[in-house]
């Protein structure tokens, strides 16, 4: 058993038809020492006296608040929360396994930029009686400060019969250093608790392998004198580092006919501008990637030809 | 570059895109592959890292580009023994188009444009001796391509942003 | 009507055991909260352990001591393991549907003495 926070304790417990369970002992908060009597969430039922309880935790029936009174007033609480473990694995009940880009990934993260800032989300099918909690820092033998802020619920989407819900965290690194080469991953820790179930979940990345620019803007069409070509031109994304010439990108376009089945020449290039040939109907698209680090493409950006 | 002159932008720019690419085509999946190990956060500690201190931002090195310079020739070096070592050439055999080859070269050429012959920095000693398992061998090479794809990667934006902003 | 009926007490040598047993009737036993009480010459009620319908115990202070409670729902049958007994636990045990034993047995005398 440990504490997660004032009043609040997690029982750790090996779940297993007919496991014994653990023996957690819960003492009053009070000088008082007789008349004291124990209660288990709204239930009046009595379940025990004395300033100190024992009480074996087998089950989520054994899971609560207890709380301890005298003369019919409440003099302390103590909230108890099971985190289960199956076959020697911490449960994973309550977040959905995303399989992006393994198995068993039930956080997902990205970074727009080099900043130190970083964005974190995961899904749930649970729609209420749920809480979660982030705690972020750089290494974990020395930490390096992370800051986190309020966890929100950044969209809901249904999936056949059921509704999906997407939770994401922003965190900040508090001395982040742009230009310098990771040597320590971040580590983001999110605790989730469902009525009485606890579960933690962690990630654990550098920033540069988590970095998604985000599409060029400005995207324009200059149609060539005399030509079936046109010259397009982009820009960096304004939440790209800066200067460009230091956090430079790369760009893949291409132009797309109206059938998705015909054929697409991509091109590649460290400039932002480039000549095709744009049918009419067609669209031409460009993403941008980290010139030197081959982390993720950004999603395209488009523009109709005509 | 010794000494205060100034080391052929241009030239070290397209040599540290070149070993970028190839750091990328000798261990292609490293972004996807979860290689960090409890205790990784010391075994890093031996491969040179280019930190916040070394003055290869872009103000570090619009005040005085050596240091930097410095730091990453130390770690070109660094790597072209470790991609020399029987590390890379033990068993497993490396497939003969494999790019490590052209990739140790990379390093020391770029390591020699920014030292001419002649001058000599302090090197950093190779490290511990290699693994005896193959799989373990195989396990390094990974990890110190992994790392090398870091490391070229800030060598390429100093070099990109020197040729953009400091050539004569 | 609810019925509670203890046995197994009886006299033993200080160091000994027994296993004490409560025969319940008249209500839904397997999903009741049970207790163990005892009440010594001269003294009140003491609340010695609490059983849950899952078989999940409670006792008393830091640990559960020489008390082990037991229960077979299958037989609607409440058991107390009493180890090392001492001259001090000479007491009428009781079980109990409340810790105040309000819906109690006529309880079983226990006798500690050599």
């Known amino acids: 058993i440990w504490e997660l926070k004032k009043d609040v304790y997690v029982v750790e417990l090996d779940w297993y038809p007919d496991a014994p369970g653990e023996m957690v002992v819960l003492t009053c908060d009070t000088p008082e020492e007789d008349g004291i009597t124990w209660t288990l969430d709204q239930s009046g039922e009595v379940l025990g006296s004395g300033k100190t309880l024992t009480i074996q935790v087998k089950e989520f029936g054994d899971a609560g608040q207890y709380t301890c009174h005298k003369g019919g007033e409440a003099l302390s609480h103590s909230l108890l929360l099971l985190h289960k473990k199956e076959d020697g694995i911490w449960s994973t009940d309550v977040l959905k396994d995303q399989k992006e880009p393994k198995n068993k990934t039930f956080l997902r993260c990205e970074a727009k930029n080099y900043s130190g800032r970083f964005t974190c989300w995961w899904l749930t099918t649970i729609s209420t009686d749920l809480t979660f909690s982030v705690k972020s820092s750089r290494g974990s033998s020395n930490p390096q400060g992370v800051t986190c802020g309020a966890v929100t619920l950044s969209a809901e989407r249904v999936r056949g019969d059921n509704k999906e819900y997407e939770y994401s965290v922003e965190c900040q690194e508090d001395s982040a250093c742009p230009a310098a080469e990771e040597r320590l991953p971040i580590e983001v820790m999110v605790d989730a608790i469902h009525k009485l179930k606890y579960e933690n979940y962690t990630s654990s990345f550098f920033i540069r392998d988590i970095i998604k620019p985000d599409p060029p803007k400005n995207l324009q069409l200059k149609p060539l004198k005399n030509s079936r070509q046109v010259e397009v031109s982009w820009e960096y994304p304004d939440t790209w580092s800066t200067p460009h010439s230091y956090f430079s990108l790369t760009f893949c376009i291409q132009v797309q006919g109206k059938s998705k089945r015909e054929k697409k020449d991509r091109i590649f290039t460290d400039k932002t501008s480039a000549t095709v040939i744009c049918r009419k109907n067609a669209s031409f698209s460009v993403q941008a990637q980290d010139r030197y680090y081959s982390s993720s493409w950004s999603e395209w950006a488009s523009v109709p030809c005509s | 570059v010794p000494g205060g002159s100034s080391p052929a932008w241009a030239q070290c720019q397209q040599l540290s895109q070149k070993l970028c690419t190839l750091a990328w085509s000798a261990h292609p999946l490293v972004g996807h592959m979860d290689l960090r190990e409890e205790g990784d956060e010391e075994t890093t500690n031996d491969v040179p890292h280019i930190q916040c201190g070394d003055g290869c931002d872009p103000q570090g090195l619009r005040d005085n580009s050596q240091f930097c310079l410095q730091r990453i020739r130390q770690g070109l070096i660094f790597y072209e023994k470790l991609l020399g070592s029987d590390i890379f050439t033990g068993e497993p055999s490396l497939l003969p188009d494999s790019p490590v080859g052209q990739l140790h070269a990379s390093l020391l050429g770029l390591s020699q444009l920014l030292q001419p012959e002649g001058h000599h920095w302090e090197t950093q000693q190779i490290p511990s001796p290699s693994p005896s398992q193959p799989w373990q061998r195989l396990l390094l090479r990974f990890k110190i391509l992994r790392s090398l794809q870091a490391f070229v990667a800030v060598a390429a934006r100093v070099f990109a942003h020197g040729a953009a902003t400091l050539s004569p | 009507e609810v019925q509670l009926v203890e046995s197994g007490g009886g006299l033993v040598q200080p160091g000994g055991s027994l296993r004490l047993s409560c025969a319940a009737s008249?209500?839904?036993?397997?999903?009741?909260?049970m207790f163990w009480l005892r009440q010594a010459p001269g003294k009140g009620l003491e609340w010695l352990s609490t059983?849950?319908?899952?078989?999940?115990?409670i006792y008393p202070g830091s640990g559960k001591g020489r008390f082990t409670i037991s229960r077979d729902n299958a037989k609607n049958t409440l058991y107390l393991q009493i180890n090392n007994l001492k001259p001090e636990d000479t007491a009428l045990y009781y079980c109990?549907?409340?810790?105040?034993?309000?819906?109690r047995g006529q309880g079983t005398q226990v006798t500690v003495s050599s």
């Open positions: 008249g209500f839904t036993f397997s999903s009741s909260v």
């Open positions: 059983i849950k319908p899952t078989g999940s115990t």
């Open positions: 109990a549907r409340d810790i105040g034993g309000t819906v």
